[in-house]
């Protein structure tokens, strides 16, 4: 049986229903069987876990997703083996295997793989700071969301009115969420906001930096 699945990965927002399209062409016999299984990201196909079987005219959802899985067409004998997964969770991200078996049609292995990413908005990030906060020193402001798919990008902004920092004294990494401030001056003091953003939304945290004369540096 030759199975057809989309070549592009599938993305579904948290809590919505994912439709994993799988079609095939075969003269369905009484021995026809369909199995859907799931592999966590980074794991080999051999470690897949079954989530649904169809055989002998009956549907058997199984495993931890059993209450949330169904078939778009039941029985799936018309050439459509599409799986519906409701109320998607972050843990549903991974690879789904659609396997159709219909002896004596052994034209190919009857296997199709679909990568699903559950889209999750960034959680409220945690803002932190380390380094010397005295005049002339350097400090690193860090920002990290524990949740978010795809991985959020981070952008730091300084709130309020302030003199433009000298070039190179403020360098940020959008991927790691780190802002490096060098050659600190008293005017570097203020509130800094980090905004974590992905296609599902954004979340932010703020941190107040107090730059002091040497030997008095601290963060409020």
């Amino acid at each position: 049986v030759e199975v057809k699945v989309p070549t592009e990965p599938l993305s579904t927002p948290l809590g919505k229903t994912a439709e994993l399209t799988c079609t095939y062409s075969t003269s369905v016999g009484d021995s026809f069987a369909l199995e859907w299984s799931f592999v966590q990201p980074g794991k080999p196909i051999s470690e897949s876990h079954p989530i649904l079987y169809f055989t002998n005219g009956h549907l058997y959802p199984t495993g931890s997703k059993s209450k949330r899985v169904s078939l778009l067409q039941n029985p799936p004998t018309v050439g459509v083996a599409t799986l519906k997964l409701t109320d998607v969770h972050p843990s549903d991200t991974g690879t789904y295997l659609c396997q159709v078996n219909n002896p004596p049609d052994f034209y190919t292995n009857g296997l199709g793989l679909i990568n699903l990413t559950v889209l999750v908005p960034p959680s409220n990030p945690l803002c932190s700071q380390s380094g010397q906060t005295s005049v002339g020193g350097s400090t690193a402001l860090r920002c990290s969301s524990s949740e978010g798919a795809p991985k959020p990008v981070y952008n730091w902004v300084r709130l309020g009115t302030f003199p433009t920092p000298s070039p190179g004294s403020m360098v940020q990494d959008e991927v790691s969420g780190q802002l490096i401030l060098t050659n600190l001056s008293l005017t570097s003091s203020g509130t800094y906001r980090c905004v974590a953003t992905n296609q599902m939304g954004s979340a932010s945290c703020e941190l107040t930096l107090s730059v002091t004369e040497p030997s008095q540096g601290r963060v409020a």
Partner: antibody
């Protein structure tokens, strides 16, 4: 030699019923998916029913669903099509056809004619 | 449902000529296409399946090509027995549907 012989075609009034038969030989009938395909007076071909090798799965297009029933008797190597609530648009030559491993039709019978008219 | 459209509806040609007819699907059917030949008063006969595979016994002057939504059947060096009607059929998802046919007549 693969052979399929249809029978049972007739002139029927609208709303009537009829059962067609197809006697197969020359191949292992019990291992083959089978279908009925009809050809309307304007020469168009339309698939009307299919059944899996052991009869577990049957499929129909919307045009006949609920009115036509396909069945088989593997002991007699015979395929059937029970038709009810017949309409004038069901007028056609009905062919019995064997399916390949994929759902194309590799052998066809000679056909039997159904005419639905008052 | 997937609609199958054949063109031309009719075609006149002479023995020895080469002809091509086309079949278009309303959506992607990959290579799941069959062609049939039907002579006057006879039942259809399978000519091609999987878009380009010829069953045993079909002469090599017949050839099928295409994938996705566009397909064609070519007959090289027409023989007298090639005249009749030709139908395409998708063998992807149910319902399986046929094109309206191309009638090949002797010029």
């Amino acid at each position: 030699e693969v052979q399929m012989v249809e029978s049972g075609g007739d002139l029927v009034k609208p709303g009537g019923s009829l059962k067609l038969s197809c006697a197969a030989s020359g191949f292992t009938f019990s291992n083959s998916g089978m279908s009925w395909v009809r050809q309307t007076p304007d020469k168009r071909l339309e698939w009307v029913a299919s059944i899996s090798d052991g009869g577990l799965y049957t499929h129909y297009p919307d045009s006949v669903k609920g009115r036509f029933t396909i069945s088989r008797d593997n002991g007699k190597s015979t395929l059937y099509l029970q038709m009810s609530s017949l309409r004038s648009e069901d007028t056609a030559i009905y062919y019995c056809a064997r399916q390949g491993v994929r759902p194309f039709f590799d052998y066809w019978g000679q056909g039997t004619t159904l005419t639905v008219s008052s | 449902d997937i609609q199958m459209t054949q063109s031309p509806a009719s075609l006149s040609a002479s023995v020895g000529e080469t002809v091509t007819m086309t079949c278009r699907a309303s959506e992607n059917i990959y290579s799941y296409l069959a062609w049939y030949q039907q002579k006057q008063g006879k039942s259809p006969q399978l000519l091609v399946f999987n878009a380009e595979t010829l069953p045993e016994g079909v002469p090599s002057r017949f050839s099928g090509t295409g994938s996705g939504t566009h397909f064609s059947l070519r007959i090289n060096s027409l023989q007298p027995e090639d005249f009749g009607s030709y139908y395409c059929q998708h063998h992807y998802v149910i319902p399986w549907t046929f094109g309206g046919g191309t009638k090949l007549e002797i010029k």
